[in-house]
Amino acid sequence: SGVFQLQLQEFINERGVLASGRPCEPGCRTFFRVCLKHFQAVVSPGPCTFGTVSTPVLGTNSFAVRDDSSGGGRNPLQLPFNFTWPGTFSLIIEAWHAPGDDLRPEALPPDALISKIAIQGSLAVGQNWLLDEQTSTLTRLRYSYRVICSDNYYGDNCSRLCKKRNDHFGHYVCQPDGNLSCLPGWTGEYCQQPICLSGCHEQNGYCSKPAECLCRPGWQGRLCNECIPHNGCRHGTCSTPWQCTCDEGWGGLFCDQDLNYCTHHSPCKNGATCSNSGQRSYTCTCRPGYTGVDCELELSECDSNPCRNGGSCKDQEDGYHCLCPPGYYGLHCEHSTLSCADSPCFNGGSCRERNQGANYACECPPNFTGSNCEKKVDRCTSNPCANGGQCLNRGPSRMCRCRPGFTGTYCELHVSDCARNPCAHGGTCHDLENGLMCTCPAGFSGRRCEVRTSIDACASSPCFNRATCYTDLSTDTFVCNCPYGFVGSRCEFPVGLPPSFPW
């Protein structure tokens, strides 16, 4: 599709006569008829196959024709065509005299013709005007002409359609030859493919507009080269999407089992030393002067009743001091100056002489103790609670408060870590002093037999077109993660253009 343009510049008819030689009255009111047709070696009358156009009266006798293109006028004359420009043409230009206002051919007398010119030749599409002048015995016509393509048509014969666009279907302008020229940031045959942010990961990233980098599921970061850990992961990271690789001090499938309770919770008080002893289990070693599971209780040094033979204990800044009853001396009132003759045994205790009467010993009835049977038995003094349990006096009886992981009257029983069936996939659980151990069946490994180690379905490289292979551990099958442009269970089929979101 294009336009043949004819620019009339000057018409000279000095004598103001018709082709017949008869003068016009009062002068030749001149208008033009133009006929454009296919190439003829000898231009003959007949259909104007490429089109016709007429002008209004442009002047009388001799006149210059004003260029009216800017004002929307009719010069240059436009002869549009809707076919491939053949490169050759025939052109007939007739000058006519209009005695009245009706310019229709049937309204004019046949001798109203002033002049007729006919040319033919080759004409390539282009912006440049060809200037021509045709002279007869009585008239002269100066004109120029050219062929240009209509909007959105390009090429040597205006046959190439190209309409610039900036939408979902393409982002381009048109080159003079009709080829597409992509707008900045776009690429592809139809400039539909955005150029992603520089460095955006080829497989993990994509973009819907230029300089963007959007990540496919499981990836994150500016360039989509960082993975996202599993949804349930608590204290772990990943090297491929949805993994959960535990941070130091954490364990379990989702890294939610605390293997370093001491560091994460600092349970021991008053400067005590903390030792991890299994999952969520720990032991506090108290500094002198403190007691309790977490060393939270301050210990009076007199609480251990260090004074014997009825001596009374007094706390001091640097320890304690025993005030001894009459007949006793020593740091703990352990030395006696008495003999059995002094009846030193209280609460029905019986006295026995020693060292030829220089010394004695009391044999105490049940529920009494001390070198003089002066103390009621403290049921906790014998430290009956095992495994670091805390002994509590409860009137005539006693009880043990056990540390985590122990039970029984005297904390003598170890709570089985295997009671929870922690070993996955039929693993066998073994209780150890500080936790448990799983013996895994064939095909599984890991601290809790949670890792499947069966045949790698990806070993045979089943994925095509540089796809990434992942083993589906639950079914021993593989899954192919296709690169952009391929689909299929093995990424074996190329995708037709243009794709929608490639994933």
Epitope: P217, G218, Q220, G221, I228, N231, C233, F501
Partner: antibody, heavy 118, light 107 residues
Framework: EVQLVESGGGLVQPGGSLRLSCAAS????????MAWVRQAPGKGLEWVAT????????YYRDSVKGRFTISRDNSKSTLYLQMNSLRAEDTAVYYC???????????WGQGTLVTVSS | DIQMTQSPSSLSASVGDRVTITCRAS??????LAWYQQKPGKSPKLLIF???NLADGVPSRFSGSGSGTDSTLTISSLQPEDFATYFC?????????FGQGTKLEIK
């Protein structure tokens, strides 16, 4: 136990600003991408913004771009949403959530109500 | 943006019933779909991710299925605590988008 606790919501006039905070615990905050999701009264859920864990890359829904800023302080295990030039249509309960724009939102806070009204 | 359309928008059922909620995406989301449960005045809770994977601690009566553009949430035997609003969400394409919700009420 994973916990996300939002704060900072309230009543604000159109054109005003608010800063929401979300205190995270029970997981290693710096290892995970985080997001804000909102829910207008009686309406559905709408993703607002996301921040990556790796390099702090941020993404926003079109209607809040240029007005809202998501940020994080890994040393305090805290996520933030600075909201400027607030509009009536921003009125919603704002939830802090663990997730990215291309992953499920695995954990959610209890939400904080933002009311934009004159 | 991908449109997510849930159906029905509300549903009445009885304890013990089998219930199905569907979610349709305006284009293929390649199984990158999650389901959430939300009770009045509470925050949403993740039930299912990647179309058919049960989230940690979610009862096995919940299940998900589907591919391409259509996904389904099924509750095999309704319990009293299951009456809530359910949302689907796609995370295949940016930005992530949610369905409008399905309110599950006691008949």
């Amino acid at each position: 136990e994973v916990q996300l606790v939002e704060s900072g919501g309230g009543l604000v006039q159109p054109g005003g600003s608010l800063r929401l905070s979300c205190a995270a615990s029970g997981f290693t905050f710096s290892n995970f991408p985080m997001a804000w999701v909102r829910q207008a009264p009686g309406k559905g859920l709408e993703w607002v913004a996301t921040i990556s864990s790796s390099d702090g890359t941020t993404y926003y829904r079109d209607s809040v771009k240029g007005r809202f800023t998501i940020s994080r302080d890994n040393s305090k295990s805290t996520l933030y949403l600075q909201m400027n030039s607030l509009r009536a249509e921003d009125t919603a309960v704002y939830y802090c959530s663990r997730g990215y724009y291309n992953s499920p939102f695995a954990y959610w806070g209890q939400g904080t109500l933002v009311t934009v009204s004159s | 943006d991908i449109q997510m359309t849930q159906s029905p928008s509300s549903l009445s059922a009885s304890v013990g019933d089998r219930v199905t909620i569907t979610c349709r995406a305006s284009e293929d989301i390649y199984s990158n779909l999650a389901w959430y449960q939300q009770k009045p005045g509470k925050s949403p809770k993740l039930l299912i991710f990647d179309t058919n994977n049960l989230a940690d601690g979610v009862p096995s009566r919940f299940s998900g299925s589907g591919s391409g553009t259509d996904s389904t949430l099924t509750i095999s035997s309704l319990q009293p605590e299951d009456f809530a609003t359910y949302f689907c969400q796609q995370y295949n394409n940016y930005p992530p988008t949610f369905g409008q919700g399905t309110k599950l009420e006691i008949k």
